[in-house]
């Protein structure tokens, strides 16, 4: 893991360079001021202690300054995400300075050696920032370090070593191996900047987690639970990206953090919102769609500064590509039955009808099981803005469409063989929009017919704004 001692150590001695290139002494880190959106433009290389390039290249001392820090590389070249990010930053912040930190020679090595070089690179960035601070009008408050993978921890070291406090660090899927569980001074952590926000897109609880699982910032956002990213499955990758191997799936999911950040820069009008939650499972159940007390935030560049005492883990669902925004809904369905039906695992689908559009048929993901005579909470999300919801169609899937469903049906039958007429009653559905925080209640279209069974459907119409019904003493008590 990275070496523990402070910025005063003999850092150059730590460099893990291939023997062949140790002869010529050159700075191992270069700073390229990207002076054009054109990725082919060579930009300007900044040199510590040399003010002329700053003037010649139009470095704006009063503007925001972004430092983009790449991660470990197998190819030794800048990957294509880099110029996408540079271009997006230039588009969003026209006057900003966009600096690419080139530490390719130190990153194009065995992963363990590259990890051991992160501290040295962080120190180089800190020295550059210290030098810039000597200039009139340059403020660390305007500095935003954006580090991808191993680069996120480099940013952490830079923030730790610099004299003063940088304004912001964004960690884009910070690297996991050799950093998971590490001491705060040996990885990205909240004390490395005034505001540290993190996107986690490739975390795995089994096997190797390329991205770090633990929260390391003031806010840690886990899109799609931080693991399986839509559009990155083997089938998707085979069809749409170069190569089409497991390696590409890994790359797709790990790099998704960068694209989510780019999306937040270029699709300002379509911000994605994340919601605070203790874990991914609770989020999948639809429990965590509150915006009260800073419990929700925009993701990526638009994230609002939150400096909590504790790490804040936040979750959201996304589309498979840009724009990534989806619309989240919490659905509370009180399911009751007149007979004891034993363990029952219905496969429910909903279709939402709105003033702008209608949703596709959406599955209600049952995270654990359906509780009878109780309120069940679900999360559904749509790719399009439906507008104001008007009605909901709830369907209980009939004939099994998969081996899993067939097994569910069989298991259900074996537990209750003498109960062929499986039937549940649902009188109303309560819906809350994550994006608008609006609460609505939908009542069964036919109050006399609230029963649903396999292969059947129920229709619900909006019957009031808000959740409390007239004559209702408590929202949790449902009378048949």
């Amino acid at each position: 893991s990275p070496t523990p001692f402070g910025p005063e150590g003999q850092l150059e001695d730590e460099l893990h360079k291939p023997k062949a290139i140790q002869t010529e002494v050159k700075p191992s880190v270069r700073f390229n001021l990207r002076t054009s959106k054109d990725p082919e433009h060579e930009g300007c290389y900044l040199s510590l202690g040399h003010s002329q390039p700053l003037e010649d290249c139009g470095f704006n001392m009063t503007a925001k300054t972004f430092f983009i820090i790449h991660g470990w590389t197998m190819s030794g070249i800048f990957e294509n995400w880099l110029h996408k990010l540079v271009s997006a930053l230039h588009t969003r912040e026209k006057d900003a300075n966009v600096v690419v930190v080139d530490w390719l020679p130190l990153a194009h090595q065995l992963y363990t050696d590259a990890v051991n070089n992160t501290r040295v690179v962080g120190h180089s960035i800190a020295r550059m920032l210290d030098w810039l601070q000597e200039k009139d009008d340059f403020s660390l408050e305007n500095v935003h370090l954006i580090g991808y993978s191993l680069g996120a921890h480099v940013a952490g070291y830079a923030g730790n070593f610099v004299k003063g406090t940088v304004g912001r660090i964004t960690g884009l899927d910070p690297a996991g191996p050799m950093f998971e569980g590490a001491d705060i001074h040996k990885r990205l952590s909240p004390d490395d900047a005034d505001f540290v926000d993190v996107l986690h897109t490739y975390t795995r609880s089994f096997g190797l987690s390329i991205g770090i699982q633990m929260p390391v910032g003031h806010i840690d956002i886990y899109p799609n639970g931080g693991d399986f990213q839509p559009g990155c499955g083997l089938n998707d990758v085979l069809g749409s990206m170069a190569y089409g191997t497991i390696t590409e799936v890994v790359k797709c999911e790990h790099e998704r953090a960068v694209h989510l950040f780019v999306d937040s820069l270029v699709n300002q009008d379509k911000p994605s919102f994340a919601f605070q939650c203790t874990d991914s499972n609770r989020f999948k159940k639809g429990i965590c769609l509150s915006c009260r007390k800073n419990r929700c935030n925009s993701i990526g560049y638009n994230a609002k500064k939150m400096r909590n005492k504790r790490n804040s883990k936040m979750y959201l669902k996304t589309r498979a590509g840009m724009p990534f925004r989806v619309y989240h809904y919490q659905m509370k369905i009180h399911v009751f039955s007149y007979k004891n039906m034993g363990e029952i695992e219905p496969t429910f689908y909903v279709t939402l009808y709105g003033t702008n559009a209608d949703s596709q048929t959406l599955p209600l993901e049952i995270v654990e099981r359906i509780e009878q005579n109780a309120t069940n909470t679900f999360l559904v999300y749509t790719e399009e803005d439906l507008g104001d919801l008007l009605k909901i169609q709830l369907t209980w899937e009939g004939a099994s469409q998969s081996w899993y469903n067939l097994w569910k049906e069989l298991r259900s039958y074996l537990s209750q063989p003498h109960n062929p007429g499986r039937e549940l009653n649902i009188r109303r559905i309560r819906v809350k929009s994550g994006e608008t925080q609006r609460k609505l209640t939908f009542c069964a279209e036919d109050p006399e017919n609230t029963s649903i069974s396999p292969g059947r459907e129920l229709w619900f119409r909006k019957c009031r704004d808000g959740w409390r019904m007239k004559n209702e003493t408590s929202p949790t008590v449902e009378l048949p």
């Epitope: 270069r30 294509n80 080139d102 170069a242």
Partner: antibody
Framework: QIQLVQSGPELKKPGETVKISCKAS????????MNWVKQAPGKGLKWMGW????????TYADDFKGRFAFSLETSASTAYLQINNFKNEDTATYFC?????????????WGQGTALTASS | DIVLTQSPASLAVSLGQRATISCKAS??????????MNWYQQKPGQPPKLLIY???NLKSGIPARFSGSGSGTDFTLNIHPVEEEDAATYYC??????????FGGGTKLEIK
């Protein structure tokens, strides 16, 4: 203007070592990567690999690992290709070509080529 | 490695007509909306010359009669109207994130 000027043609005996040069001018040498491309007589182009002109770190295509070596003389803005234990199948024209580190990696300027021929 | 297959291997086109050269990749060379496919022209005794990069972008100084199109695995170079000086061999090349960067086998264009 931007130019890549390569050393002249050479006749080599099998087993010998040959080193060809590619001198860059008109741009900052260390700001662009340098590729090497082989073209056997009457055949197509084959990418051999590239060298980071700033760090000196070379990357070789699988078919060119072992007997081939890329190197630099940064002060002279020159890249070199060395072929050890020259073989008959090394008879070809070798091109150097630069690419932008920051862009889409296409080869925008090429050297005129150096013809290497095996003599028996 | 990504294999690029060019077709036809050679073609003869009358002056002023359209020449169409195809390049098929064994896997997609697309990345986030961009296609990492380039086209080069090579005349006998000369080095290759870049014509088109990122599938459809014309390099400055190259005549507008050259155009590129395609995405994913299928790409096309069009020359219209063909001129005498366009007689050459044309190569496609992919430059995706991870080398090796490969070339197609080449298409020899003859002017009738």
């Amino acid at each position: 203007q931007i130019q890549l000027v390569q050393s002249g043609p050479e006749l080599k005996k099998p087993g010998e070592t040959v080193k060809i040069s590619c001198k860059a001018s008109g741009y900052t040498f260390t700001n662009y990567g340098m590729n090497w491309v082989k073209q056997a007589p009457g055949k197509g182009l084959k990418w051999m690999g590239w060298i980071n002109t700033y760090s000196g770190v070379p990357t070789y295509a699988d078919d060119f690992k072992g007997r081939f070596a890329f190197s630099l003389e940064t002060s002279a803005s020159t890249a070199y290709l060395q072929i050890n234990n020259f073989k008959n199948e090394d008879t070809a024209t070798y091109f150097c070509a630069r690419f932008s580190y920051y862009g889409r990696h296409y080869f925008d300027y090429w050297g005129q080529g150096t013809a290497l021929t095996a003599s028996s | 490695d990504i294999v690029l297959t060019q077709s036809p291997a050679s073609l003869a086109v009358s002056l002023g007509q359209r020449a169409t050269i195809s390049c098929k990749a064994s896997q997609s060379v697309d990345y986030d909306g961009d296609s990492y496919m380039n086209w080069y022209q090579q005349k006998p005794g000369q080095p290759p010359k870049l014509l088109i990069y990122a599938a459809s972008n014309l390099k400055s100084g190259i005549p507008a009669r050259f155009s590129g199109s395609g995405s994913g695995t299928d790409f096309t170079l069009n020359i219209h109207p063909v001129e005498e000086e366009d007689a050459a061999t044309y190569y496609c090349q992919q430059t995706t994130d991870d080398p090796p960067w490969t070339f197609g086998g080449g298409t020899k264009l003859e002017i009738k």
